[in-house]
């Protein structure tokens, strides 16, 4: 058993049929010595008396808010949560496996630049009685500071018969140099509590590996005389690291109709303009990627050919 | 401790091409190592990230773009002194700071070159003959060093009398290649910045 935060404790249980469970001793936070009784949640049934209460925690029915009273007055609370371990593996029931970039990916993180700011998000089908707490650091043995905000519900989607909820959090490394060469990864830890179930999820990454630039901005077309070719130009996204001659991007320019199966024109360039063939009912799209370290491509920025 | 804007005229910077070749060669070699050594811990997640140039050179700090010198987090640099002549400078108005930057890059390359050559000698003794260093990568390191053209003491190639542990050598190769790729990215960024300035 360990303390998650003040008056909230996590009991780690091996979860299998007829498991013996964990013996837990609760102590009432009071100078009083006698006349103390214990109850669980909203029940008025007295579970025991005295300054300490010993319980055997085996299942969710044994978890909850234990309260010690004296003469009708509440003295203190202890909330017990369960963390299940099945076949030596901690449960991952609360969050959905996003399976990208590999199986057992529950947290996904992206950074728009090298400033040390990044966003992580996760998915769940649970809509109520759900809380998240996020901590982060650079390295684990001698951790350096990363400050994370509160996790917020950022999107709701309908997937078949189920609703899916996306939560996200923004974090900022306390003293980040955009030009630094990372040797210690960023560690992100998410505590998830659903009703009386506790789970924790972790992700470890280098900022350089989670870079995904914003789409290029200000796409413009200039038709070339006596030709089907058009010159398309664009600019670096505002959120990208500066100076751009140091943090350079490379671009992919594509002309395509509405269907992905349609024919297309595609060209890669390090410049902020390119010449392509425009077709009726097609769109010109441009996306960006770090020129020197191939992490993710940005989303497409698009303009219609016409 | 930074690169000023008064740098060589555009198109007068011969090292850019070599640095692009370097990054390409290292990336290819790392990819080959990851494929060939698929049953060894050779991915970015599996290896320890070590920098053999730590406390010996300070390329990131010495080559910091002017725009980032306002960022205090970028300025906790180590003081290192370097030789200050080199052909990539290509301009009389080149500053001392830039010479410091380029000589730091040269020292990085020299250190990695020695490590790679020592390691290749060990790998050539491996009866499995599983992996060797790409001669193209070694040649590209050499070309960039020649383009930088700094005078520097020769670092003797390390020789070891004991029987090499090939498993450890291959893991060290992975560690070295990952670190060198990261440094090659920095070198490419620096050369691009200097070329554009």
């Amino acid at each position: 058993i360990w303390e998650l935060k003040k008056d909230v404790y996590v009991v780690e249980l091996d979860w299998y049929p007829d498991a013996p469970g964990e013996m837990v001793v609760l102590t009432c936070d009071t100078p009083e010595e006698d006349g103390i009784t214990w109850t669980l949640d909203q029940s008025s049934e007295v579970l025991g008396s005295g300054k300490t209460l010993t319980i055997q925690v085996k299942e969710f029915g044994d978890a909850g808010q234990y309260t010690c009273h004296k003469g009708g007055e509440v003295l203190s609370h202890s909330l017990l949560l369960l963390h299940k371990k099945e076949d030596g593996i901690w449960s991952t029931d609360i969050l959905k496996d996003q399976k990208e970039p590999k199986n057992k990916t529950f947290l996904r993180c992206e950074a728009k630049n090298y400033s040390g700011r990044f966003t992580c998000w996760w998915l769940t089908t649970i809509s109520t009685d759900l809380t998240f707490s996020v901590k982060s650091s650079r390295g684990s043995s001698d951790p350096q500071g990363v400050t994370c905000g509160a996790a917020t519900l950022s999107a709701e989607r309908v997937r078949g018969d189920n609703k899916e909820y996306e939560y996200s959090v923004e974090c900022q490394e306390d003293s980040a140099c955009p030009a630094a060469e990372e040797s210690l990864p960023i560690e992100v830890m998410v505590d998830a509590v659903h009703k009386l179930k506790y789970e924790n999820y972790t992700s470890s990454f280098f900022i350089r590996d989670i870079i995904k630039p914003d789409p290029p901005k200000n796409l413009q077309l200039k038709p070339l005389k006596n030709s089907r070719q058009v010159e398309v130009s664009w600019e670096y996204p505002d959120t990208w690291s500066t100076p751009h001659s140091y943090f350079s991007l490379t671009f992919c320019v594509q002309v395509q109709g509405k269907s992905k199966r349609e024919k297309k024109d595609r060209v890669f360039t390090d410049k902020t303009s390119a010449t392509v063939i425009c077709r009726k009912n097609a769109s010109i799209s441009v996306r960006a990627q770090d020129r020197y370290y191939s992490s993710s491509w940005s989303e497409w920025a698009s303009v219609p050919c016409s | 401790r930074n690169l000023p804007v008064a740098t060589p005229d555009p198109g007068m910077f011969p090292c850019l091409h070599h640095s692009q070749n370097l990054l390409r060669a290292v990336s290819n070699m790392l990819q080959k190592a990851r494929q060939t050594l698929e049953f060894y811990p050779c991915t970015s997640e599996e290896i320890d990230h070590e920098d053999i140039t730590k406390d010996k050179t300070s390329t990131v700090e010495a080559c910091l773009p002017l725009e980032l010198t306002k960022n205090e987090s970028c300025l906790n640099s180590r003081e290192t002194s370097f030789i200050t002549n080199g052909s990539c400078l290509a301009s009389r108005k080149t500053s001392f700071m830039m010479a410091l930057c380029l000589s730091s890059i040269y020292e990085d390359l020299k250190m990695y070159q020695v490590e790679f050559k020592t390691m290749n000698a060990k790998l050539l003794m491996d009866p499995k003959r599983q992996i060797f260093l790409d001669q193209n990568m070694l040649a590209v390191i050499d070309e960039l060093m020649q383009a930088l053209n700094f005078n520097s003491e020769t670092v003797p190639q390390k020789s070891s009398l004991e029987e090499p542990d090939f498993y450890k050598t291959k893991i060290k190769l992975c560690i070295l290649l990952h670190a060198f790729r990261i440094r090659a990215v920095t070198i490419d960024r620096v050369m691009s910045y200097l070329n554009a300035s």
């Epitope: 490379t250 199966r261 349609e262 595609r266 077709r279 | -």
Partner: antibody
Framework: QVQLVQSGAEVKKPGSSVKVSCKAS????????LHWVRQAPGQGLEWMGW????????EYAPKFQGRVTITADESTSTAYMELSSLRSEDTAVYMC???????????WGQGTLVTVSS | DIVMTQSPLSLPVTPGEPASISCRAS??????LHWYQQKPGQAARLLIA???QSISGVPSRFSGSGSGTDFTLTISSLQPEDFATYYC?????????FGQGTKVEIK
């Protein structure tokens, strides 16, 4: 299986024209760009131009502009390349090639030898 | 026009040995570079697109690398069926242009 089958060899006099055909099978004809590339004896490959069979749009290499015409007949899934004012240096194998991507070629025809000789 | 220069023009190789063909562009073409194999009397075959993207159905012994002006096609271990002429082609700008070709011959 996508295939491009070209017409047979031709012998032409200088100053005349030649029209080579390229019949496509497998896949929808108008879903692909169609290009013509030639190879003179002992020489490398030379791109001549492309057509979008869907709308008849064409683009030609400046070297052939005014002498080459590329057309396409959707009903027969056939593309044609006509080269006029033939000279002896036009003696070459003419190949058609296609792809959904405009700028490179994933399927090639077997080639048609055109000999220009007086 | 962008001029593509291949080297060597002839490459004698022992079967089972690796082979590398170089292609250089007269100006930077990013990764807009494709490789083809051609055998006498046969249709050409696309091997690699955009400098390093492998093509479905092409054996994994063929790989490509490079960007900017310098590109390489590598055959890790030459098989008897690989003796042919190889061409690079740039797609950075029109007109599309090819290298002169490299003939890989049995040593």
């Amino acid at each position: 299986q996508v295939q491009l089958v070209q017409s047979g060899a031709e012998v032409k006099k200088p100053g005349s024209s030649v029209k080579v055909s390229c019949k496509a099978s497998g896949g929808t004809f108008s879903d692909y760009y169609l290009h013509w590339v030639r190879q003179a004896p002992g020489q490398g490959l030379e791109w001549m131009g492309w057509i979008d069979p869907e709308n008849g749009d064409t683009e030609y290499a400046p070297k052939f502009q005014g002498r080459v015409t590329i057309t396409a007949d959707e009903s027969t899934s056939t593309a044609y390349m006509e080269l006029s004012s033939l000279r002896s240096e036009d003696t070459a194998v003419y190949m058609c090639a296609r792809n959904k991507e405009l700028r490179y070629f994933d399927v090639w025809g077997q080639g048609t030898l055109v000999t220009v000789s007086s | 026009d962008i001029v593509m220069t291949q080297s060597p023009l002839s490459l004698p190789v022992t079967p089972g040995e690796p082979a590398s063909i170089s292609c250089r562009a007269s100006q930077s073409i990013s990764i807009n570079l494709h490789w083809y194999q051609q055998k006498p009397g046969q249709a050409a075959r696309l091997l690699i697109a955009f400098a390093s993207q492998s093509i479905s159905g092409v054996p994994s012994r063929f790989s490509g690398s490079g960007s900017g002006t310098d590109f390489t096609l590598t055959i890790s271990s030459l098989q008897p069926e690989d003796f042919a002429t190889y061409y690079c082609q740039q797609s950075n700008s029109f007109p599309l242009t090819f290298g002169q070709g490299t003939k890989v011959e049995i040593k």
